[in-house]
């Protein structure tokens, strides 16, 4: 086993140079010192090593820094960043935005989305700010990575980034994430008015509260059914038939095609059938006339 062999006499290198290209893999394992590699990372990148040799160097560095690489080394990683896994990156402490941008440049076009996202998350965790430059450096990676950040990390994301978020970016976000992103979006678009505001905010409405939706229903926004379906059930069921009618405008007719699917079905179950009948759409599933609604959540609290 490579680990057991001792370094042959005279083979211990004092610097990273081309001689190492000609070492056997077991000799690299036995002879190369991780701190030397860390000190001369520029040469590790400059000299044409093989994939296997670079993997050995990575192993040596990991053994030298089991708690994660120091920032002084991370700053020098350059192309060696390609050998680092997202799990490695989660151990790092990165405070320099320049380091992040440099490494993001290295990862571009390398199928390294997971590493890039982990790097930015690690930077945010250390109190860094995700500025628009950094989002641009993340390039073609869909902003769905916002959903991978912890809620604490999300707090560090400036509201201005919300301008760059597209409709599909939030599909996999948890409810908690959506709520936080919605607040940021409200703040980002606060100076935008009318329909333009609605066009921007609708991507984030999955995080809106019932109060927010009520307010929105006063503005003739004519929400499309696709946006309506993305609203959180808890907020939606609190809206009356009249409020939903205002919210959807002419798109109210599309409720019929969705009546047996969540969240429309959940909303219907909470409405009085007589109110639904007034819409003239043939919607079924409301509370029959004369029935009393018991909130079982309250009962459970006392049992």
């Amino acid at each position: 086993d490579a680990e057991q062999k001792a370094c042959p006499p005279g083979k211990e290198p004092y610097k990273v140079d081309e001689d190492l290209i000609f070492y056997q893999n077991w000799e690299l394992e036995a002879c190369v010192d991780g701190t030397m590699l860390a000190r001369q990372m520029d040469l590790v990148n400059e000299i044409p090593f093989t994939y296997e040799q670079l993997s050995i160097f990575k192993h040596k560095l990991d053994k030298t820094y089991p708690q994660g690489y120091p920032e002084s080394l991370i700053q020098q990683l350059g192309h060696f960043f390609r050998y680092v896994s997202p799990e490695d990156i989660h151990q790092w402490n990165v405070t320099s935005p320049d380091t992040v941008k440099t490494l993001l440049k290295v990862s571009k076009g390398q199928k390294m989305n997971a590493q890039a996202i982990a790097l930015v998350a690690c930077y945010l965790r250390g109190g860094g700010q995700l500025d628009e430059d950094m989002v641009k450096a993340l390039g073609d990676i869909p902003l769905s990575y916002l959903c991978d950040f912890s809620p604490q990390d999300l707090h560090s994301v400036p509201s201005s980034v919300m301008w760059l978020v597209g409709p599909q970016d939030l599909d996999k976000c948890s409810q908690r994430h959506l709520g936080l992103l919605y607040q940021k979006a409200c703040s980002a678009f606060q100076n935008v008015s009318g329909l333009e505001y609605f066009e921007k905010i609708k991507t984030f409405l999955g995080g809106a509260s019932v109060k927010d939706l009520r307010a929105l229903s006063q503005h003739n926004v004519s929400m499309d059914i696709a946006t309506f379906k993305r609203l959180q059930v808890d907020s939606l069921v609190g809206l009356s038939v009249a409020e939903v009618q205002k919210l959807l405008g002419p798109n109210i007719v599309d409720l019929k095609t969705e009546e047996d699917k969540s969240p429309v079905r959940d909303w219907l179950f909470r409405q009085h059938q007589k109110d639904l009948d007034r819409l003239g759409l043939g919607l079924q599933g409301g509370i029959p006339n004369g029935y009393l609604v018991l909130d079982f959540n309250v009962r459970e609290a006392f049992s």
């Epitope: 990148n45 400059e46 044409p48 090593f49 093989t50 994939y51 040799q53 670079l54 350059g78 192309h79 060696f80 390609r82």
Partner: nanobody
């Protein structure tokens, strides 16, 4: 598309010589180093010699020093390896390689040419 095509391999008696050639096409202008690696049956791949195309600096593995010479023809984007005093342990498939500066591992590999040294 980058192509590295090796030629000159074959069977030779121990003590004999061979000249391997590698013709490169499609290499980016920025490439700065070429070389030869070899792999014997059941052994790991190992570097034989490299040459920095910009400076002409050459490096060799210990076991071929004094017996091998790597040289380049910049105009033709080609590199050759002259091997003298061949030994049975030089038997392997020889691969031509090329790389751009600071770009991680060797990016471009040829298909290889077989060298067999019989005793």
């Amino acid at each position: 598309q980058v192509q590295l095509v090796e030629s000159g391999g074959g069977t030779v008696q121990a003590g004999g010589s061979l000249k391997l050639a590698c013709a490169a096409s499609g290499l980016p202008r920025t490439y700065n180093v070429m070389g030869w690696f070899r792999q014997a049956p059941g052994k790991e791949r190992e570097g034989v010699a490299i040459i920095y195309t910009t400076t002409g600096a050459t490096y060799y593995r210990d076991s071929v020093k004094g017996r091998a010479t790597i040289s380049q023809d910049n105009a033709k984007k080609s590199v050759s390896l002259q091997m003298n005093s061949l030994r049975p342990e030089d038997t392997a498939i020889y691969y031509c390689v090329a790389r751009q500066p600071n770009s991680g591992p060797w990016e471009y590999w040829g298909q290889g040419t077989q060298v067999t040294v019989s005793s």
